[in-house]
């Protein structure tokens, strides 16, 4: 058993049929010695008396808010949560496996630049009685500070018969130099509590590996005289690290119709303009990627050909 | 000494061309190592990230773009210099800061060159003959060093009398390649910045 926060404790349980469970001793936070009784949740049934209560925690029915009273007055609370371990593996029931970039990916993180600011998100099908708490650091043995905000519900989607909820959090490394060469990864830890179930999820990464620039901005087309060719130009996204001559991007320019199966014109360039062949009912799209360290491509910025 | 004309565009900053070749060569070598040593811990997640130049050179700080010198976090505790202007071209005057940056890059290359050559000598003794260093990568390191045109003491190649542990050598190769790739990215960024200056 360990303390998650004040008056909230996590009991780690090996979860299998007829498991013996864990013996837990609760102590009432009071100078009083006599006349103390214990109850669980909203029940008025007295579970025991005395300053300490010893319980055998085996299942979710044994978890919850234990309260010690004296003469009708509440003295203190202890909330017990369960953390299940099945076949030596901690449960991951609360969050959905996003399977990208690999299986067992519950947390996904992205950074728009090298400033040390990043966003992580996760998915769940649970809609109520759900809380998240996020901590982060650079390295684990001698951790350096990363400050994370509160996790918020950022999107709701319908997936077949189920509703899916996306939560996200923004974090900022306290003292980040965009030009630094990372040798210690960022660690992100998410505590998830659903009703009386506790789970924790972690992710470890270098900012350089989670870079995904914003799409190029200000796409413009200029038809070339006596030709089907069009000169398309664009600018670096505002959120990208500066100076741009140091933090350079490379671009992919594509002309394609509505369907992905349609024929296309595609060209890669380090410049902020390119010449392509425009077709009726097609769109010109441009996306960006760090020129020197191949992490993710940005989303496409698009303009119609016509 | 005249710089080798290794770039098709005569106006182009020659070190930029060499640094692009360097990044490409080390990336290819790292990819090859990850594929060949698939049963060794050779991915970014599996290895310890060590920097053999730590406390010996200060490339990131010495080559910091002017715009980032206002960023407290980039100035650390070391004496930091930053790029003002200039290039690798022998005909142009380079500032003191600039020379500091380029000499730091040169020292990095020299240290990695020695490490890679020592390692290759060990790998050539491996009866499995599983992996060797790409000669192209070693040649590209040499070309960039020549283009930087610094003279410095020759670092003797480390020789070891003990029987090499090939497993450890291969893991060290992975560690070294990962670190060198990150440094090659920094070098490329610096050269690109200088080219635009």
């Amino acid at each position: 058993i360990w303390e998650l926060k004040k008056d909230v404790y996590v009991v780690e349980l090996d979860w299998y049929p007829d498991a013996p469970g864990e013996m837990v001793v609760l102590t009432c936070d009071t100078p009083e010695e006599d006349g103390i009784t214990w109850t669980l949740d909203q029940s008025s049934e007295v579970l025991g008396s005395g300053k300490t209560l010893t319980i055998q925690v085996k299942e979710f029915g044994d978890a919850g808010q234990y309260t010690c009273h004296k003469g009708g007055e509440v003295l203190s609370h202890s909330l017990l949560l369960l953390h299940k371990k099945e076949d030596g593996i901690w449960s991951t029931d609360i969050l959905k496996d996003q399977k990208e970039p690999k299986n067992k990916t519950f947390l996904r993180c992205e950074a728009k630049n090298y400033s040390g600011r990043f966003t992580c998100w996760w998915l769940t099908t649970i809609s109520t009685d759900l809380t998240f708490s996020v901590k982060s650091s650079r390295g684990s043995s001698d951790p350096q500070g990363v400050t994370c905000g509160a996790a918020t519900l950022s999107a709701e989607r319908v997936r077949g018969d189920n509703k899916e909820y996306e939560y996200s959090v923004e974090c900022q490394e306290d003292s980040a130099c965009p030009a630094a060469e990372e040798s210690l990864p960022i660690e992100v830890m998410v505590d998830a509590v659903h009703k009386l179930k506790y789970e924790n999820y972690t992710s470890s990464f270098f900012i350089r590996d989670i870079i995904k620039p914003d799409p190029p901005k200000n796409l413009q087309l200029k038809p070339l005289k006596n030709s089907r060719q069009v000169e398309v130009s664009w600018e670096y996204p505002d959120t990208w690290s500066t100076p741009h001559s140091y933090f350079s991007l490379t671009f992919c320019v594509q002309v394609q119709g509505k369907s992905k199966r349609e024929k296309k014109d595609r060209v890669f360039t380090d410049k902020t303009s390119a010449t392509v062949i425009c077709r009726k009912n097609a769109s010109i799209s441009v996306r960006a990627q760090d020129r020197y360290y191949s992490s993710s491509w940005s989303e496409w910025a698009s303009v119609p050909c016509s | 000494r005249n710089l080798p004309v290794a770039t098709p565009d005569p106006g182009m900053f020659p070190c930029l061309h060499h640094s692009q070749n360097l990044l490409r060569a080390v990336s290819n070598m790292l990819q090859k190592a990850r594929q060949t040593l698939e049963f060794y811990p050779c991915t970014s997640e599996e290895i310890d990230h060590e920097d053999i130049t730590k406390d010996k050179t200060s490339t990131v700080e010495a080559c910091l773009p002017l715009e980032l010198t206002k960023n407290e976090s980039c100035l650390n505790s070391r004496e930091t210099s930053f790029i003002t202007n200039g290039s690798c071209l022998a005909s142009r005057k380079t500032s003191f800061m600039m020379a500091l940056c380029l000499s730091s890059i040169y020292e990095d290359l020299k240290m990695y060159q020695v490490e890679f050559k020592t390692m290759n000598a060990k790998l050539l003794m491996d009866p499995k003959r599983q992996i060797f260093l790409d000669q192209n990568m070693l040649a590209v390191i040499d070309e960039l060093m020549q283009a930087l045109n610094f003279n410095s003491e020759t670092v003797p190649q480390k020789s070891s009398l003990e029987e090499p542990d090939f497993y450890k050598t291969k893991i060290k190769l992975c560690i070294l390649l990962h670190a060198f790739r990150i440094r090659a990215v920094t070098i490329d960024r610096v050269m690109s910045y200088l080219n635009a200056s």
């Epitope: 199966r261 024929k263 296309k264 595609r266 060209v267 890669f268 360039t269 009726k280 | -």
Partner: antibody, heavy 118, light 107 residues
């Protein structure tokens, strides 16, 4: 199986024209760009131009501009390349090639040898 | 027009040995570079697209690398069927242009 089948070899006199055909099978004809590339005996490859069979748009290499015409007939899934004012240096194997991507070629025809000789 | 220069023009190789062919562009073409193989009396066959992207059906011993002006096609271990002429082609701008070809011959 995508295939491009070209017309047979031709012998032409200098100053005349030649029209080579390229019939496509497998896949929808208009879903691909179609190019013509030639290869003189013992020489390298030389791109001549492309057509978008969907709308008839064409683009030619400046070297052949005014002398080459590429057309396509969607009803028969056939593309044509006509080269006029032939000279001896036009003696070459002419290939048609296609792709969903405009600027490179994933499927090639077997080639048509055009000999220009007086 | 962008001029593509291949080297060497002829490459004698022992079967089972690796081979590398270089292709250089007269100006930067990013990764807009493709490789083809041609055997005598046959049409070219696509090997690699956009400098390093492999094609299904092409043996994994063929790999491409490079960007900007310098590109390389590598055959990790030459098989008897690999003796042919190899061409690079740029798609950065029209007109599309090819290298002059590299003939890989049996040593």
């Amino acid at each position: 199986q995508v295939q491009l089948v070209q017309s047979g070899a031709e012998v032409k006199k200098p100053g005349s024209s030649v029209k080579v055909s390229c019939k496509a099978s497998g896949g929808t004809f208009s879903d691909y760009y179609l190019h013509w590339v030639r290869q003189a005996p013992g020489q390298g490859l030389e791109w001549m131009g492309w057509i978008d069979p969907e709308n008839g748009d064409t683009e030619y290499a400046p070297k052949f501009q005014g002398r080459v015409t590429i057309t396509a007939d969607e009803s028969t899934s056939t593309a044509y390349m006509e080269l006029s004012s032939l000279r001896s240096e036009d003696t070459a194997v002419y290939y048609c090639a296609r792709n969903k991507e405009l600027r490179y070629f994933d499927v090639w025809g077997q080639g048509t040898l055009v000999t220009v000789s007086s | 027009d962008i001029v593509m220069t291949q080297s060497p023009l002829s490459l004698p190789v022992t079967p089972g040995e690796p081979a590398s062919i270089s292709c250089r562009a007269s100006q930067s073409i990013s990764i807009n570079l493709h490789w083809y193989q041609q055997k005598p009396g046959q049409a070219p066959r696509q090997l690699i697209y956009f400098a390093s992207q492999s094609i299904s059906g092409v043996p994994s011993r063929f790999s491409g690398s490079g960007s900007g002006t310098d590109f390389t096609l590598t055959i990790s271990s030459l098989q008897p069927e690999d003796f042919a002429t190899y061409y690079c082609q740029q798609s950065n701008s029209f007109p599309l242009t090819f290298g002059q070809g590299t003939k890989v011959e049996i040593k």
